[in-house]
Structures are given as structure tokens and as C-alpha cells.
Amino acid sequence: EDISEPPLHDFYCSRLLDLVFLLDGSSRLSEAEFEVLKAFVVDMMERLRISQKWVRVAVVEYHDGSHAYIGLKDRKRPSELRRIASQVKYAGSQVASTSEVLKYTLFQIFSKIDRPEASRIALLLMASQEPQRMSRNFVRYVQGLKKKKVIVIPVGIGPHANLKQIRLIEKQAPENKAFVLSSVDELEQQRDEIVSYLCDLAPEAPPPTLPPHMAQVTV
């Protein structure tokens, strides 16, 4: 049975969508900035009709590896999923590898496509640049995600976000629209535009199919 809760906001995305939040856990974001990033993710989640039938979410913090806090198949109340998202720990790592997290998204999160009717989106929140040695297979992973029809939306935050990688992602598919922000302070201003963009990429649920009419028996 679907675990639903009443909407918290006027705008509420009720579409068929698998959405993955990928949070940069590098020290390029201070602990305070990471708090703002988490608040943004939770705010976004409040505007989605989260359930196994409508919008499924995953939340991953990435540094030199990836740490999944929520999986797409987690059957929990939306409020509990938001609580878990708010508990994402600040890693403050030297490195946050976008290549590694896209590889994780490709081979772990979207290894099997169990909802072909839903749109698949990875929201890549990035504030840093991985070392070149780590980015050798970056394009391959972006292309792999494209093959699986996973849209990648990069959100560059602050002066250290890897603009070269953002442009590479954008080049792979027209839907891969980037949002480039000068700081985390702009996340709240851009939130509704980002949610609207994601929501518009996802299909509405088809109307329920009615059983065929029973043959009328006339006496």
C-alpha cells in the first residue's frame, strides 16, 4: 500500500519520477554551507509527491566514494524520508568525485530499470573539482546514464564548481540543463524553478484503465 501524506505546499509535483539527489561532501562547502544544501534538498522533497507510485527519491552524499542515505525503493513515509535527508552528515572531505558518484548512480541506483514508465533524473549538486586522475571515465559514465535515459541536472554552486564537467554534461543531452549559482544562498531563490523543470520532464500518470464492459444480457 502507498504511504502518502497531505501536500505541504501549493506547488506539488505529482508525476512519475525517479529522482536522485547527489550532494557534494567536499570541504569546498563549509559546514554551514552544507547545512543550507541539506535544507534545500529537504525543501525540494516537500514539493514532491513522494511515494513508490509517484516520485521515488534517493539521497547520496559523495566524496571520494558515495554514501547512500535513501534508496529509490525505500518504503517510508515522506516525512521520515525528509528526516533521513536532514541527517546527512557533513564529510568535509578533500575530494568529492563526480565521476565516482555518477558511476554509482549508473551501476547501483539505476542498474535495473524497474519503472520504465517513469522519468529518471540525477540532480548533481556540485561545489568542487575532482582531481584529473579521477575524472578519466567521467564522459563514459555520463554517456552510460544517457543510454539508460537518465537525465543529469548539474547544479554548480560557488566559485570552485567544475564548469568544464557541467558543460560536458549539458552537451550530452538537451534535457541536461545546468543551473550555475554563485553560492548556496541562491539555492532557495532557484528552488521553485529547479523543481518545476524536473517536474516538467516527468510524465503524468496515465488514467486508470477501466475493465472492459460486461456483455449486456437481454432477456
Epitope: 559546514e31 543550507v36 557533513y90
Partner: nanobody
């Protein structure tokens, strides 16, 4: 178990300054994100300011530019320098700490903090 003790409150005129202190007992203080909240009479407790273990800060819009938070890990103390005080700043000010080893949360929510002080009263008269 961490104990927090606020001090420095009092009665001042509008436009004056005050410095609140929050002394913490217990180990690992330097790794704890800290915050100040306040509760005005008849109102709910509200977030004022946050300071991370890395000294990074977040301010509520109502105090930005007037209040400054800092921490001295050697003294296990967090300070709140309040300038250009207004009558609407009148409240009980609470210090809060989060044990980041096993808890996290959203910085402006009370439920994100594990330890609380008893509060210190700040009254600003016009």
C-alpha cells in the same frame, strides 16, 4: 553528557550592545556545531545563528549584520556579540549544541540539537 551554561544577558537601551557567552562542559566540544535560539514572550523559540565546527556561520535575516557568533575551542565557549539591539530582540536566548558524531539535522530546527542551556534573558527597552 554535555552541559551548556549561558551568561551575559541583561536589560539595555535600544541601540546598545551585549555579549552573551555559552560555556560548555564535556569533551569533543570543538567538533560540535552550535547555535543560538531565542524565545520572545508568547512566541515560539526561533533560530538566531549557527556556527560549525569549522567556524563557518549562518544568521537569520533578522539579526544579520548586527549579531556576530564566534567560538573559542580552547575555552569551550561560544560567544554571541549583539550590537544595535532593538526592542524586538527582547527574548530568552538559548545556546544549543549538536553531537555531530551521531546526530545531524537542519540548522534552523530545534530538533537538530541534542543539548540545550537554561537560557539567559535579554531585555531591550525603547
Amino acid at each position: 553528557q554535555v552541559q551548556l551554561q549561558e551568561s551575559g544577558g541583561g536589560l539595555v537601551q535600544a541601540g546598545a550592545s551585549l555579549r552573551l557567552s555559552c560555556a560548555a562542559s564535556g569533551r569533543s566540544f570543538s567538533s560540535y556545531p552550535m547555535a543560538w535560539f531565542r524565545q520572545a514572550p508568547g512566541k515560539e523559540r526561533e533560530f538566531v545563528v549557527f556556527i560549525g565546527s569549522d567556524h563557518s556561520t549562518l544568521y537569520s535575516t533578522s539579526v544579520r549584520g548586527r549579531f556576530t557568533i564566534s567560538r573559542d575551542n580552547a575555552k569551550n565557549t561560544v560567544y554571541l556579540q549583539m550590537m544595535n539591539l532593538k526592542p524586538e530582540d527582547t527574548a530568552v536566548y538559548y545556546c544549543a549544541a549538536r553531537n555531530s558524531a551521531w546526530s545531524s539535522g537542519i540548522y534552523y530546527r530545534e530538533t537538530s540539537y541534542d543539548y540545550w542551556g537554561q537560557g539567559t534573558q535579554v531585555t531591550v527597552s525603547s
